[in-house]
Structures are given as structure tokens and as C-alpha cells.
């Protein structure tokens, strides 16, 4: 079938990286420049990605492969492909329509992006809390009484509240 | 007791590709995050990749990203490693690592460690 | 270069008490948890520490972890033969939205 179809379609012939030139008798032409082919047979290059503004090139555009964008320092990719960047926010924050606001107490996010999530209820497993959360960090939940042998580390008892945010050391 | 078989590990060329697995058993696969770390003979601990359960998050070293990619499917119990245009630095011995904290009731792993390792596999890149 | 600053090595005798250390920033050990694990020869990693100072069951209690500030640090005392091996520190960082190892501490028990 491919042998027929090469026999039928000289365009098949041409590699990535070229085109089929209808203009010029089907023969196979390279991309112009600032564009690429990634897969055999085509009859048109496709036009290199740009990375532009808050994007920044991570891998240029080759004759067979498109341009990679990333985000310039203080942002981060969304979407397929890095299609978007947003903005960065600092540990203990979450990106608001007002900007980077700080968890509110009993919530954190431990990465530069997302949102404050609810700190980990350990009663759920039957646990108790070996070390509070602040802003930054979830709660650490430890083993259950009956869960303790020996080399285990004890299970501490919560320490008094404290301010979100405040790390213990 | 939690048991991780690493294989697809092997010799490859310079920009060639590889898929790593990791069979995982003994816990429930799909509350867990999931790690790959890897060590070149005689050298530090490097950690690559780590995929969540819950949301599918996947974060990579800046050193392989772009070429990596982290997968898992939890119905079979399998971890996944992609590796494509490889270099004479990736070369190492891989490891699949268990993180600790079951989700979703623990919101965050980072504090609980790794706390099951496989035995590796090793990866060679070479002409 | 690693992100996390430990020791090539260490070294102590039987019986006696080695510190390692591991220091970072504000983005990794300053606001997250610190976990240790300890490389025997020709082996994987096993998780020592975890939360900064917690001992998963089964590990003795010779093994001790602090942090202050940006630094952490493993005590290891009563020193045993056994215990000659790679240490190795770890934590998030949220700069680089991944974890990141230090270089490890070769221990000798002399």
C-alpha cells in the first residue's frame, strides 16, 4: 500500500523538515526559514511558535520541530504546551484577582502556585498531630497510639496555635 | 510490605529513548505520591520526577524537563518513567520511590519523606 | 552544585557521637520539612528521618534530627559499624517546584 500510495503521491517522498512544492512540480522543498515540518508528506510548513513577552524560548525552532516556550522567572506555565504563564506567588500565598494574598489560617500551600488548601484533618485517619501547620506547611499527622513501637518516634501533643505562617524550628 | 520492582533499564545511544516501569505492590498505589530518583555510579542523589494521585501534578527536575515524562496508571499499579533525547548525564541507576502520607486525607507529602524504594535499574548512554 | 550543602564526609569511633549537617535557604529547609536517609554500600536509600526530626518506626533512636533556621542536622550516637554509609538530606523546594537531595556525607566509623 505505502509502495502504491509513493507511486500515486510523490508528495510522500518528501521528509520532514521539507515540503511539497505544488509551484514548483511537487518536488520537495525545505521550510523557509521561521518554519517547520514535523512529519513527512506535508504540503505546507507550519509557522514557528514565538515566544514572546513572559514567554521565553526553551528550545528553538528547528526545519522539523516547532519552538518550546517556558515563562520568564516569576511566572510558570499553564497549559498544554505552556500555552499561558501567570504569575508566581510566594510559599504561604495563592493568586487572588488582587494579586498574591497570604493562606488564612488553617489552610497552606507549600508551592509557588495553586491555592491554600486545608490543612490535613488527622482525626480523619485516627491520628494526632505530631507538628502544626503554619501558612507554608501542612499539619504532620503521627502515628496512632497503638501504631507505636519501639524506635518510633513519640507523638508529640499540638503545641498552642500559632499565627499562620510562624515555622516552628 | 511495600515492594517496588524497577525494569526497562539498559544500554542506549546519545538521543535515543527509553521507558523505565516500576511495579509497585504491598500498599494502595493509588494514594500515593510517586517519585523517580536517580544516582550516577559514584556520585550524589538526584531527584527527577514526582507524579500525584489525586490531581495528576507532575513536577520535574529542571535537568530533564522538556525530555522526561512522569506517568502512572494506578489501575495497573505501574509507574512510568518516558525518556527521550538522552544524554551522557542521565546515565544511572534509576530508583522508584514511595512518598509517605496517604491521600486524600494528607494534603501535602513533603514532610513524610520517601519512605520505600525500589532496588533500580540501571540506564547506560553510550555511543 | 547542589541546593543543599552537606559534608563530604565524616567520620567518629564506636561508641561516640557524629553530627552531619545540611544547609540550604529560605525557599527549601527554611520553610519546609527536612528528611534523612541513610545509603548503605551497594544499596537504595532508606528514609531515616522524616518532619525534621521523627523516626519512622523501626529506626533506633541513636539516630536524632534538628533544624534551625536554614541548617539541619542528624545526630548519630552510640556509633556502630553498621552505621558506615551515605547520608543524605532532603526537602522541597518551592523556587524550583521539586525536591532537591544534598550531595551526602560519607560517615566512617573508625
Known amino acids: 500500500f505505502e509502495r502504491t500510495r509513493s507511486l500515486q503521491d510523490p508528495c510522500s517522498n518528501c521528509p520532514a523538515g521539507t515540503f511539497c512544492d505544488n509551484n514548483r512540480n511537487q518536488i520537495c522543498s525545505p521550510c523557509p526559514p521561521n518554519s517547520f515540518s514535523s512529519a513527512g508528506g506535508q504540503r505546507t510548513c507550519d509557522i514557528c511558535r514565538q515566544c514572546k513577552g513572559v514567554f521565553r524560548t526553551r528550545k528553538e525552532c528547528s526545519s522539523t520541530s516547532n519552538a518550546e516556550c517556558d515563562c520568564t522567572p516569576g511566572f510558570h506555565c499553564l497549559g498544554a504546551g505552556c500555552s499561558m504563564c501567570e504569575q508566581d506567588c510566594k510559599q504561604g500565598q495563592e493568586l487572588t484577582k488582587k494579586g498574591c494574598k497570604d493562606c488564612c489560617f488553617g489552610t497552606f500551600n507549600d508551592q509557588k502556585r495553586g491555592i491554600c488548601r486545608p490543612w490535613t484533618n488527622c482525626s480523619l485517619d485516627g491520628k494526632s498531630v505530631l507538628v502544626n501547620g503554619t501558612k507554608e506547611r501542612d499539619v504532620v499527622c503521627g502515628p496512632s497510639p497503638a501504631d507505636l513501637s519501639p524506635g518510633a518516634s513519640s507523638v508529640t501533643p499540638p503545641a498552642p496555635a500559632r499565627e499562620p505562617g510562624h515555622s516552628p524550628q | 510490605e511495600v515492594q517496588l520492582l524497577e525494569s526497562g533499564g539498559g544500554l542506549v545511544q546519545p538521543g535515543g529513548s527509553l521507558r523505565l516501569s516500576c511495579a509497585a505492590s504491598?500498599?494502595?498505589?493509588?494514594?500515593?505520591?510517586m517519585s523517580w530518583v536517580r544516582q550516577a555510579p559514584g556520585k550524589c542523589l538526584e531527584w527527577v520526577s514526582v507524579?500525584?494521585?489525586?490531581?495528576?501534578?507532575?513536577y520535574y527536575a529542571d535537568s530533564v524537563k522538556g525530555r522526561f515524562t512522569i506517568s502512572r496508571d494506578n489501575s495497573k499499579n505501574t509507574l512510568y518513567l518516558q525518556m527521550n533525547s538522552l544524554r551522557a548525564e542521565d546515565a544511572a541507576v534509576y530508583y522508584c520511590?514511595?512518598?509517605?502520607?496517604?491521600?486524600?486525607?494528607?494534603?501535602?507529602?513533603?514532610?513524610?519523606?520517601?519512605?520505600?524504594w525500589g532496588q533500580g535499574t540501571l540506564v547506560t548512554v553510550s555511543s | 552544585q547542589s541546593v543543599l550543602t552537606q559534608p563530604p564526609s565524616a567520620s567518629g569511633t564506636p561508641g561516640r557521637r557524629v553530627t552531619i549537617s545540611c544547609s540550604g535557604s529560605?525557599?527549601?529547609?527554611?520553610?519546609?520539612?527536612v528528611t534523612w536517609y541513610q545509603q548503605l554500600p551497594g544499596t537504595a536509600p532508606k528514609l531515616l528521618i522524616y518532619a525534621d526530626s521523627h523516626r519512622p518506626s523501626g529506626v533506633p533512636d541513636r539516630f536524632s534530627g534538628s533544624k534551625s533556621g536554614t541548617s539541619a542536622s542528624l545526630a548519630i550516637s552510640g556509633l556502630r559499624s553498621e552505621d558506615e554509609a551515605d547520608y543524605y538530606c532532603a526537602t522541597w523546594d518551592y523556587s524550583l517546584s521539586g525536591y532537591v537531595f544534598g550531595c551526602g556525607t560519607k560517615l566512617t566509623v573508625l
Open positions: 504491598g500498599f494502595t498505589f493509588s494514594g500515593y505520591d
Open positions: 529560605s525557599s527549601n529547609i527554611g520553610n519546609n520539612y
Open positions: 520511590a514511595k512518598h509517605g502520607g496517604q491521600k486524600p486525607t494528607t494534603k501535602s507529602s513533603s514532610a513524610y519523606g520517601m519512605d520505600g
Open positions: 507524579i500525584y494521585p489525586d490531581d495528576g501534578n507532575t
